[in-house]
Protein backbone atom coordinates (compact mmCIF):
# COMPACT_ATOMS: atom_id res chain seq x y z
CA UNK A 1 0.00 0.00 0.00
CA UNK A 2 1.39 3.43 -0.90
CA UNK A 3 2.24 5.80 1.92
CA UNK A 4 3.02 9.49 2.31
CA UNK A 5 5.62 10.89 4.68
CA UNK A 6 5.76 14.47 5.94
CA UNK A 7 8.74 16.18 7.57
CA UNK A 8 8.54 19.65 9.11
CA UNK A 9 11.67 21.56 10.10
CA UNK A 10 12.18 25.03 11.51
CA UNK A 11 15.14 26.83 9.99
CA UNK A 12 17.88 27.61 12.51
CA UNK A 13 18.73 30.87 10.73
CA UNK A 14 15.16 32.17 10.70
CA UNK A 15 13.18 30.86 13.66
CA UNK A 16 9.79 31.51 12.06
CA UNK A 17 10.77 30.04 8.71
CA UNK A 18 9.72 26.46 8.00
CA UNK A 19 10.70 23.80 5.50
CA UNK A 20 8.15 21.11 4.72
CA UNK A 21 9.26 18.00 2.87
CA UNK A 22 6.83 15.34 1.66
CA UNK A 23 7.29 12.11 -0.21
CA UNK A 24 5.24 9.37 -1.80
CA UNK A 25 6.21 5.76 -1.20
CA UNK A 26 4.45 3.87 -3.96
CA UNK A 27 4.81 2.60 -7.50
CA UNK A 28 2.43 5.00 -9.26
CA UNK A 29 3.51 8.12 -11.08
CA UNK A 30 2.45 11.34 -9.39
CA UNK A 31 -0.07 13.59 -11.16
CA UNK A 32 -0.49 16.29 -8.53
CA UNK A 33 0.74 17.23 -5.06
CA UNK A 34 -1.23 19.60 -2.84
CA UNK A 35 0.32 21.09 0.29
CA UNK A 36 -1.94 22.70 2.88
CA UNK A 37 -1.69 23.99 6.41
CA UNK A 38 -4.16 24.01 9.29
CA UNK A 39 -5.43 20.58 8.29
CA UNK A 40 -6.26 18.67 5.12
CA UNK A 41 -7.56 20.52 2.10
CA UNK A 42 -11.35 20.65 2.27
CA UNK A 43 -11.37 20.07 6.03
CA UNK A 44 -10.41 23.52 7.20
CA UNK A 45 -6.95 23.54 5.66
CA UNK A 46 -5.60 26.29 3.42
CA UNK A 47 -3.71 25.48 0.26
CA UNK A 48 -0.09 26.59 0.23
CA UNK A 49 1.09 25.03 -3.03
CA UNK A 50 -0.01 22.79 -5.88
CA UNK A 51 2.69 21.01 -7.85
CA UNK A 52 2.07 19.38 -11.23
CA UNK A 53 4.90 17.44 -12.90
CA UNK A 54 4.16 18.88 -16.35
CA UNK A 55 2.16 22.04 -15.86
CA UNK A 56 4.28 23.60 -13.17
CA UNK A 57 3.93 24.92 -9.64
CA UNK A 58 1.43 27.30 -8.07
CA UNK A 59 2.05 28.70 -4.61
CA UNK A 60 0.37 31.12 -2.26
CA UNK A 61 1.72 33.25 0.60
CA UNK A 62 3.36 32.53 2.95
CA UNK A 63 4.86 29.84 0.68
CA UNK A 64 8.16 31.15 -0.65
CA UNK A 65 9.57 28.30 -2.68
CA UNK A 66 7.93 25.04 -3.67
CA UNK A 67 9.90 22.57 -5.75
CA UNK A 68 10.21 18.94 -6.77
CA UNK A 69 13.09 17.17 -5.04
CA UNK A 70 12.56 13.88 -6.90
CA UNK A 71 9.72 12.49 -9.05
CA UNK A 72 7.96 11.46 -5.85
CA UNK A 73 8.98 14.06 -3.26
CA UNK A 74 8.64 17.80 -2.87
CA UNK A 75 9.81 20.56 -0.56
CA UNK A 76 8.28 23.86 0.43
CA UNK A 77 9.84 26.81 2.23
CA UNK A 78 7.54 29.15 4.15
CA UNK A 79 8.20 32.82 4.85
CA UNK A 80 8.80 33.59 8.48
CA UNK A 81 7.34 37.05 8.89
CA UNK A 82 3.87 38.54 8.70
CA UNK A 83 0.45 37.84 10.14
CA UNK A 84 0.05 34.68 8.12
CA UNK A 85 3.29 33.06 9.27
CA UNK A 86 3.05 29.58 10.85
CA UNK A 87 3.56 28.82 14.52
CA UNK A 88 5.32 25.85 16.12
CA UNK A 89 2.20 23.65 16.40
CA UNK A 90 0.87 24.31 12.89
CA UNK A 91 -0.17 21.15 11.03
CA UNK A 92 0.98 20.72 7.44
CA UNK A 93 -0.60 18.19 5.07
CA UNK A 94 0.53 16.75 1.77
CA UNK A 95 -1.77 14.98 -0.65
CA UNK A 96 -0.30 12.98 -3.52
CA UNK A 97 -2.60 12.07 -6.41
CA UNK A 98 -1.55 9.21 -8.66
CA UNK A 99 -3.53 8.04 -11.70
CA UNK A 100 -5.31 5.69 -11.81
CA UNK A 101 -4.58 4.55 -8.23
CA UNK A 102 -5.98 7.56 -6.36
CA UNK A 103 -4.88 9.88 -3.57
CA UNK A 104 -2.87 9.45 -0.40
CA UNK A 105 -2.45 12.07 2.28
CA UNK A 106 -0.50 12.57 5.50
CA UNK A 107 -0.05 15.45 7.93
CA UNK A 108 2.75 16.46 10.24
CA UNK A 109 3.89 19.27 12.47
CA UNK A 110 7.10 20.43 14.05
CA UNK A 111 8.39 17.74 16.43
CA UNK A 112 8.64 18.66 20.14
CA UNK A 113 12.44 18.66 19.95
CA UNK A 114 14.41 20.81 17.53
CA UNK A 115 15.45 17.72 15.54
CA UNK A 116 13.79 17.23 12.16
CA UNK A 117 10.67 15.09 12.55
CA UNK A 118 9.21 12.41 10.37
CA UNK A 119 5.59 11.34 10.43
CA UNK A 120 3.59 9.17 8.07
Amino acid sequence: TPEVWVQVRMEATELSSFTIRCGFLGSGSISLVTVSWGGPNGAGGTTLAVLHPERGIRQWAPARQARWETQSSISLILEGSGASSPCANTTFCCKFASFPEGSWEACGSLPPSSDPGLSA
Partner: antibody, heavy 120, light 107 residues
Framework: DVKLVESGGGLVKLGGSLKLSCAAS????????MSWIRQTPEKRLELVAA????????YYLDTVKGRFTISRDNAKNTLYLQMSSLKSEDTALYYC?????????????WGQGTSVTVSS | SIVMTQTPKFLLVSAGDRVTITCKAS??????VAWYQQKPGQSPKLLMY???NHYTGVPDRFIGSGYGTDFTFTISTVQAEDLAVYFC?????????FGGGTKLEIK
Protein backbone atom coordinates in the same frame (compact mmCIF):
# COMPACT_ATOMS: atom_id res chain seq x y z
CA ASP B 1 -12.75 23.66 -28.45
CA VAL B 2 -12.35 20.30 -26.66
CA LYS B 3 -14.08 17.47 -28.50
CA LEU B 4 -14.29 13.72 -27.85
CA VAL B 5 -15.99 11.60 -30.51
CA GLU B 6 -16.61 7.90 -29.93
CA SER B 7 -17.16 5.33 -32.67
CA GLY B 8 -17.17 1.57 -33.19
CA GLY B 9 -20.28 0.60 -31.25
CA GLY B 10 -22.96 -1.66 -32.62
CA LEU B 11 -24.84 -4.92 -32.32
CA VAL B 12 -22.62 -7.89 -31.57
CA LYS B 13 -23.23 -11.57 -30.82
CA LEU B 14 -22.60 -13.06 -27.38
CA GLY B 15 -18.90 -13.91 -27.11
CA GLY B 16 -18.03 -11.56 -29.96
CA SER B 17 -15.55 -8.69 -30.15
CA LEU B 18 -15.70 -4.98 -30.82
CA LYS B 19 -13.17 -2.15 -30.83
CA LEU B 20 -14.25 1.30 -29.72
CA SER B 21 -12.35 4.45 -30.67
CA CYS B 22 -12.42 7.95 -29.24
CA ALA B 23 -10.98 10.75 -31.38
CA ALA B 24 -9.81 13.70 -29.28
CA SER B 25 -9.26 17.24 -30.48
CA UNK B 26 -8.88 20.76 -29.08
CA UNK B 27 -6.39 19.90 -26.31
CA UNK B 28 -2.98 18.30 -25.77
CA UNK B 29 -4.19 14.71 -25.66
CA UNK B 30 -0.86 13.31 -24.43
CA UNK B 31 -1.10 15.39 -21.22
CA UNK B 32 -4.39 13.97 -19.99
CA UNK B 33 -5.53 10.75 -18.37
CA MET B 34 -8.50 9.15 -20.12
CA SER B 35 -11.25 6.67 -19.30
CA TRP B 36 -14.07 4.64 -20.75
CA ILE B 37 -17.27 4.89 -18.72
CA ARG B 38 -20.41 2.97 -19.53
CA GLN B 39 -24.02 3.70 -18.74
CA THR B 40 -26.13 0.60 -18.30
CA PRO B 41 -29.73 0.32 -19.52
CA GLU B 42 -30.70 1.01 -15.87
CA LYS B 43 -28.76 4.33 -16.22
CA ARG B 44 -26.01 3.42 -13.75
CA LEU B 45 -22.53 4.77 -14.50
CA GLU B 46 -19.48 2.48 -14.28
CA LEU B 47 -15.88 3.33 -14.97
CA VAL B 48 -14.83 0.41 -17.15
CA ALA B 49 -11.19 1.20 -17.90
CA ALA B 50 -8.73 4.04 -17.38
CA UNK B 51 -5.28 4.86 -18.73
CA UNK B 52 -2.78 7.46 -17.65
CA UNK B 53 -1.39 10.15 -19.95
CA UNK B 54 1.64 8.19 -21.18
CA UNK B 55 -0.26 4.91 -21.53
CA UNK B 56 1.79 3.01 -18.95
CA UNK B 57 -0.69 2.66 -16.07
CA UNK B 58 -4.13 1.17 -16.60
CA TYR B 59 -7.17 0.22 -14.53
CA TYR B 60 -9.98 -2.23 -15.33
CA LEU B 61 -13.30 -2.91 -13.69
CA ASP B 62 -13.15 -6.40 -12.17
CA THR B 63 -15.92 -7.73 -14.42
CA VAL B 64 -14.04 -6.81 -17.62
CA LYS B 65 -10.49 -7.80 -16.60
CA GLY B 66 -8.94 -10.15 -19.15
CA ARG B 67 -11.64 -9.35 -21.72
CA PHE B 68 -11.19 -5.60 -22.33
CA THR B 69 -8.00 -3.71 -23.20
CA ILE B 70 -7.65 0.06 -23.02
CA SER B 71 -4.93 1.71 -25.08
CA ARG B 72 -4.06 5.06 -26.59
CA ASP B 73 -2.13 6.45 -29.51
CA ASN B 74 -0.89 9.88 -28.50
CA ALA B 75 0.42 10.54 -32.01
CA LYS B 76 -3.10 10.02 -33.40
CA ASN B 77 -4.92 11.65 -30.44
CA THR B 78 -7.04 8.53 -30.10
CA LEU B 79 -8.22 6.36 -27.22
CA TYR B 80 -9.26 2.73 -27.79
CA LEU B 81 -11.19 0.01 -26.00
CA GLN B 82 -10.79 -3.50 -27.38
CA MET B 83 -13.65 -5.65 -26.10
CA SER B 84 -13.74 -9.42 -26.49
CA SER B 85 -15.75 -12.36 -25.07
CA LEU B 86 -18.65 -9.95 -24.80
CA LYS B 87 -21.45 -10.76 -22.37
CA SER B 88 -25.03 -9.53 -22.23
CA GLU B 89 -24.16 -7.40 -19.18
CA ASP B 90 -21.71 -5.42 -21.35
CA THR B 91 -24.70 -3.90 -23.16
CA ALA B 92 -24.45 -0.19 -22.47
CA LEU B 93 -23.72 3.24 -23.84
CA TYR B 94 -19.93 3.71 -23.75
CA TYR B 95 -18.47 7.17 -23.17
CA CYS B 96 -14.87 8.27 -23.30
CA UNK B 97 -13.94 11.03 -20.88
CA UNK B 98 -10.99 13.22 -20.00
CA UNK B 99 -9.72 13.52 -16.42
CA UNK B 100 -8.47 16.86 -15.15
CA UNK B 101 -5.65 16.58 -12.60
CA UNK B 102 -6.41 20.00 -11.14
CA UNK B 103 -10.01 18.94 -10.48
CA UNK B 104 -9.13 15.88 -8.43
CA UNK B 105 -9.38 13.62 -11.51
CA UNK B 106 -12.98 14.69 -12.14
CA UNK B 107 -14.07 14.12 -15.74
CA UNK B 108 -14.43 17.54 -17.30
CA UNK B 109 -15.20 16.47 -20.88
CA TRP B 110 -17.25 13.52 -22.11
CA GLY B 111 -18.00 12.29 -25.61
CA GLN B 112 -21.53 11.77 -26.91
CA GLY B 113 -21.28 7.99 -26.38
CA THR B 114 -21.41 4.93 -28.62
CA SER B 115 -23.94 2.17 -28.06
CA VAL B 116 -22.94 -1.47 -27.61
CA THR B 117 -25.64 -4.14 -27.68
CA VAL B 118 -24.72 -7.76 -27.01
CA SER B 119 -27.35 -10.18 -28.27
CA SER B 120 -27.74 -13.93 -28.03
CA SER C 1 -14.23 -0.69 -3.78
CA ILE C 2 -15.82 2.42 -2.29
CA VAL C 3 -19.62 2.45 -2.49
CA MET C 4 -21.34 5.81 -3.02
CA THR C 5 -24.92 5.65 -1.74
CA GLN C 6 -26.97 8.47 -3.22
CA THR C 7 -30.43 9.52 -1.97
CA PRO C 8 -33.15 10.10 -2.96
CA LYS C 9 -33.57 8.31 -6.29
CA PHE C 10 -36.32 10.68 -7.41
CA LEU C 11 -37.27 14.26 -6.62
CA LEU C 12 -40.44 15.94 -7.81
CA VAL C 13 -40.19 19.67 -7.21
CA SER C 14 -41.58 23.00 -8.35
CA ALA C 15 -39.55 25.76 -9.94
CA GLY C 16 -38.19 27.98 -7.17
CA ASP C 17 -37.88 25.15 -4.65
CA ARG C 18 -34.68 24.32 -2.79
CA VAL C 19 -33.55 20.70 -3.17
CA THR C 20 -30.85 18.66 -1.51
CA ILE C 21 -29.29 15.40 -2.65
CA THR C 22 -27.03 13.40 -0.34
CA CYS C 23 -24.21 11.03 -1.08
CA LYS C 24 -22.62 8.77 1.53
CA ALA C 25 -19.28 7.05 0.93
CA SER C 26 -18.56 3.64 2.48
CA UNK C 27 -15.19 5.01 3.66
CA UNK C 28 -13.55 8.42 3.75
CA UNK C 29 -12.91 9.93 0.32
CA UNK C 30 -11.64 13.23 1.83
CA UNK C 31 -12.76 15.99 -0.58
CA UNK C 32 -12.34 14.00 -3.80
CA VAL C 33 -15.98 14.17 -4.83
CA ALA C 34 -17.48 15.48 -8.05
CA TRP C 35 -21.09 16.04 -9.09
CA TYR C 36 -22.42 15.60 -12.62
CA GLN C 37 -25.63 16.58 -14.37
CA GLN C 38 -27.09 14.49 -17.18
CA LYS C 39 -29.93 16.04 -19.13
CA PRO C 40 -32.22 13.78 -21.21
CA GLY C 41 -30.44 12.48 -24.31
CA GLN C 42 -27.11 14.05 -23.34
CA SER C 43 -23.84 12.88 -21.84
CA PRO C 44 -23.00 13.74 -18.22
CA LYS C 45 -21.56 17.19 -17.57
CA LEU C 46 -19.28 18.18 -14.71
CA LEU C 47 -20.85 20.62 -12.25
CA MET C 48 -18.67 20.51 -9.13
CA TYR C 49 -15.24 19.19 -8.28
CA UNK C 50 -13.39 18.89 -4.96
CA UNK C 51 -16.88 18.84 -3.39
CA UNK C 52 -17.63 22.56 -3.56
CA ASN C 53 -15.77 24.07 -6.51
CA HIS C 54 -17.89 25.16 -9.45
CA TYR C 55 -16.81 24.01 -12.89
CA THR C 56 -16.54 26.76 -15.53
CA GLY C 57 -19.91 28.36 -16.27
CA VAL C 58 -21.85 26.49 -13.58
CA PRO C 59 -24.34 28.80 -11.83
CA ASP C 60 -23.86 29.46 -8.13
CA ARG C 61 -27.32 28.14 -7.30
CA PHE C 62 -25.58 24.76 -7.32
CA ILE C 63 -23.88 24.21 -3.96
CA GLY C 64 -21.72 21.31 -2.80
CA SER C 65 -20.56 20.56 0.72
CA GLY C 66 -19.13 17.81 2.91
CA TYR C 67 -15.91 16.02 3.73
CA GLY C 68 -14.93 12.45 4.49
CA THR C 69 -18.02 10.27 4.05
CA ASP C 70 -21.03 12.60 3.94
CA PHE C 71 -21.75 14.95 1.07
CA THR C 72 -24.66 17.12 0.01
CA PHE C 73 -25.53 18.77 -3.25
CA THR C 74 -28.07 21.57 -3.16
CA ILE C 75 -29.89 23.56 -5.81
CA SER C 76 -30.90 26.69 -3.95
CA THR C 77 -33.60 27.76 -6.43
CA VAL C 78 -34.63 25.11 -8.91
CA GLN C 79 -35.19 26.26 -12.48
CA ALA C 80 -36.96 24.46 -15.30
CA GLU C 81 -33.67 23.75 -17.10
CA ASP C 82 -32.41 21.80 -14.06
CA LEU C 83 -34.54 18.81 -15.13
CA ALA C 84 -31.87 16.09 -15.20
CA VAL C 85 -30.29 13.16 -13.41
CA TYR C 86 -27.55 14.09 -10.93
CA PHE C 87 -24.67 11.80 -10.01
CA CYS C 88 -22.01 12.01 -7.32
CA UNK C 89 -18.63 10.38 -7.93
CA UNK C 90 -15.57 9.71 -5.81
CA UNK C 91 -12.06 9.93 -7.27
CA UNK C 92 -10.20 9.26 -4.05
CA UNK C 93 -9.33 5.63 -4.68
CA UNK C 94 -9.47 3.44 -7.73
CA UNK C 95 -11.94 2.28 -8.88
CA UNK C 96 -13.66 5.65 -9.23
CA UNK C 97 -17.29 4.97 -8.34
CA PHE C 98 -20.56 6.79 -8.92
CA GLY C 99 -23.71 7.15 -6.91
CA GLY C 100 -26.86 5.61 -8.36
CA GLY C 101 -28.22 8.96 -9.52
CA THR C 102 -31.08 11.24 -8.55
CA LYS C 103 -33.71 12.05 -11.14
CA LEU C 104 -35.01 15.57 -10.70
CA GLU C 105 -38.43 16.20 -12.19
CA ILE C 106 -40.21 19.53 -12.33
CA LYS C 107 -43.94 19.73 -11.49
Amino acid sequence: DVKLVESGGGLVKLGGSLKLSCAASGFTFSSYHMSWIRQTPEKRLELVAAINSNGINTYYLDTVKGRFTISRDNAKNTLYLQMSSLKSEDTALYYCARHEDYYGFAMDYWGQGTSVTVSS
Amino acid sequence: SIVMTQTPKFLLVSAGDRVTITCKASQSVTNDVAWYQQKPGQSPKLLMYYVSNHYTGVPDRFIGSGYGTDFTFTISTVQAEDLAVYFCQQAYRSPWTFGGGTKLEIK
